[in-house]
């Protein structure tokens, strides 16, 4: 280790490179400066992402993976640091960058939105479930009429190209559907989506975007909702949605609409049953929706409401939605 009175001059790392290793993914690599003295001290490196989004962190190893959009270019710097309890010594920065890809910004797509959904797998020999992906976008305002767009997603180490597109009136792809993907329902990794394009008339700038799964996962509605009236008690029950998340991971909202006076009651629950006191003169429609609870992942989207069930008035026998 360094003695208190020992002077050390820190030199910047060498051979700093940025390599694109996948869709919206780069690998930063560098080497320790060969002229660095006191090689036995605990040297670290500070990595600074300059663009497209500022970030900085420290590492002891000489490489770093970074998940980032690349359509705006990418710029990073790294320097050697030596820190103890009292001070921080640092070298000058070594920098590298990736330029924005060719094509004017107006040629790339805009308003890319994606949603995931869980469905039963019709192909599987076992009763298993798949994560589907649906994305839509708008054609770039400066894109020539012959522009064609192509969508890819990456999740973890899987990258797939879209095979099922929807088109606009000019035959340009404006939406994509993956019935089955390698996306994990419970995954915590970013979903990376890239839409690039081609035209005979000009370069089309690609567009990539990162999505947090919790923010785009369209939860299925609750299953087997039943409602039954006994006197002035309305009993509602349901089952958890088709989902990778277990039973304790759901919040629910129950909506009870009195069709006679228009009164709307909405209750938020963590259980899969609810009892409401009602008048026995009215007819009611009942709906339930679900969301994954913040106990199990970050807050996300509510499901669609279940199909309405009508009870009350002359319909005192239980009704079931299948």
């Amino acid at each position: 280790d360094l003695l208190p009175d020992e002077k050390i001059s820190l030199l910047p790392p060498v051979n700093f490179t940025i390599k694109v290793t996948g869709l919206a993914q780069v690998l930063l690599q560098w080497k320790p400066n060969p002229d660095q003295e006191q090689r036995n001290v605990n040297l670290e490196y500070q990595v600074k992402i300059n663009a497209p989004k500022e970030d900085d962190y420290e590492t002891r190893i000489t490489e770093s993976k970074c998940v980032t959009i690349l359509h705006k270019g990418f710029s990073a710097s790294v320097r050697t640091i030596l820190q103890n309890d009292h001070s921080l010594l640092a070298s000058s920065w070594a920098s590298a960058e990736l330029h924005a890809p060719p094509g004017s910004p107006g040629t790339s797509i805009v308003n890319l939105t994606c949603t995931t959904n869980t469905t039963e797998d019709n192909y599987s020999r076992l009763r298993s479930y798949q994560v589907s992906l649906h994305c839509t976008w708008l054609v770039g305002t400066d894109a020539p009429e012959d522009t064609q767009y192509f969508l890819y997603y990456r999740y973890g180490s899987w990258t797939e190209e879209c095979q099922e597109y929807s088109k606009d009136t000019l035959g340009r792809n404006i939406a994509c559907w993956f019935p089955r993907t390698f996306i994990l329902s419970k995954g915590r990794d970013w979903l990376a989506v890239l839409v690039n394009g081609s035209s005979k008339h000009s370069a089309i700038r690609p567009f990539d975007q990162l999505f947090a799964l919790h923010a785009i996962d369209q939860i299925n509605p609750p299953l087997n909702v039943t409602a039954e009236i006994e006197g002035t008690r309305l009993s509602i029950q349901w089952e958890k949605p088709v989902s990778a998340f277990p039973i304790h991971c759901f919040d629910y909202e129950v909506k009870i609409h009195n069709t006679r006076n228009g009164y709307l009651q909405i209750e938020k629950l963590m259980t899969n049953a609810f009892i409401s006191i009602i008048d026995d003169l009215s007819k009611y429609d009942v709906q339930v929706r679900a969301a994954v609870s913040s106990m199990c992942r970050e807050a996300g989207l509510w499901s669609e409401w279940s199909q309405p069930i009508y009870v009350g008035n002359d319909e005192h026998k239980p009704l079931r939605e299948w």
Partner: antibody
Framework: QVQLQESGGGLVQPGGSLRLSCAAS????????MSWVRQAPGKGLEWVSA????????NYADSVKGRFTISRDNAKNTLYLQMNSLRAEDTAVYYC??????????????WGQGTMVTVSS | QAGLTQPPSVSAAPGQRVTISCSGS?????????VHWYQQVPGTAPKLLIF???NRPSGVPDRFSGSKSGTSASLAITGLQAEDEADYYC????????????FGGGTKLTVL
Amino acid sequence: QVQLQESGGGLVQPGGSLRLSCAASGFTFSNYAMSWVRQAPGKGLEWVSAINSGGKSTNYADSVKGRFTISRDNAKNTLYLQMNSLRAEDTAVYYCADYATNYGVPYFGSWGQGTMVTVSS
Amino acid sequence: QAGLTQPPSVSAAPGQRVTISCSGSRSNIGSGYDVHWYQQVPGTAPKLLIFDDNNRPSGVPDRFSGSKSGTSASLAITGLQAEDEADYYCQSYDSSLSGHVVFGGGTKLTVL
């Protein structure tokens, strides 16, 4: 009845190459991602590689990346594993298996009987 | 080190109950990812025994069951029979691994 039948194993010298095949029948091959899993003598299972149903997307274990190439011919219902720059540690029984997923987590529902690859001088 | 840890061997007498543990980490089982179990009778290919933590494919007796808690999973076999003597492997998804597939080292079950 799902059937997976591997072939192409044998004895090869270090640095050599070998191509394994897996003939599939009894299911719609083109609907399924497929995989290779290996097992060294007296050892456990090690996932090697996988390929999506259309054959355009592939994945490899770090131990074989850059040396092995997985591919498929859906018209022939056949999965392949091209193995180059073979090493002694690649000696194993190589199994062909379907790469199914449940909520995205992979599992291997059907397996072939395996083909033995021995890398030795 | 990435991977799932299993005991190398377990043994029990016929008719007894035995459990095989599978210990992981936050990058696999601890993230809630499903665990699958395989049975490999000596000299044969592995066979899927349990998928999605606790579901049995058709043809697998209900003597086999799976469970999961925290960063660990376990396989339980009740009413042990001689034909259950085999190697058992757990498998899951690991977000830290290239390719994401992770197996346990395997457990040799001996029926005494």
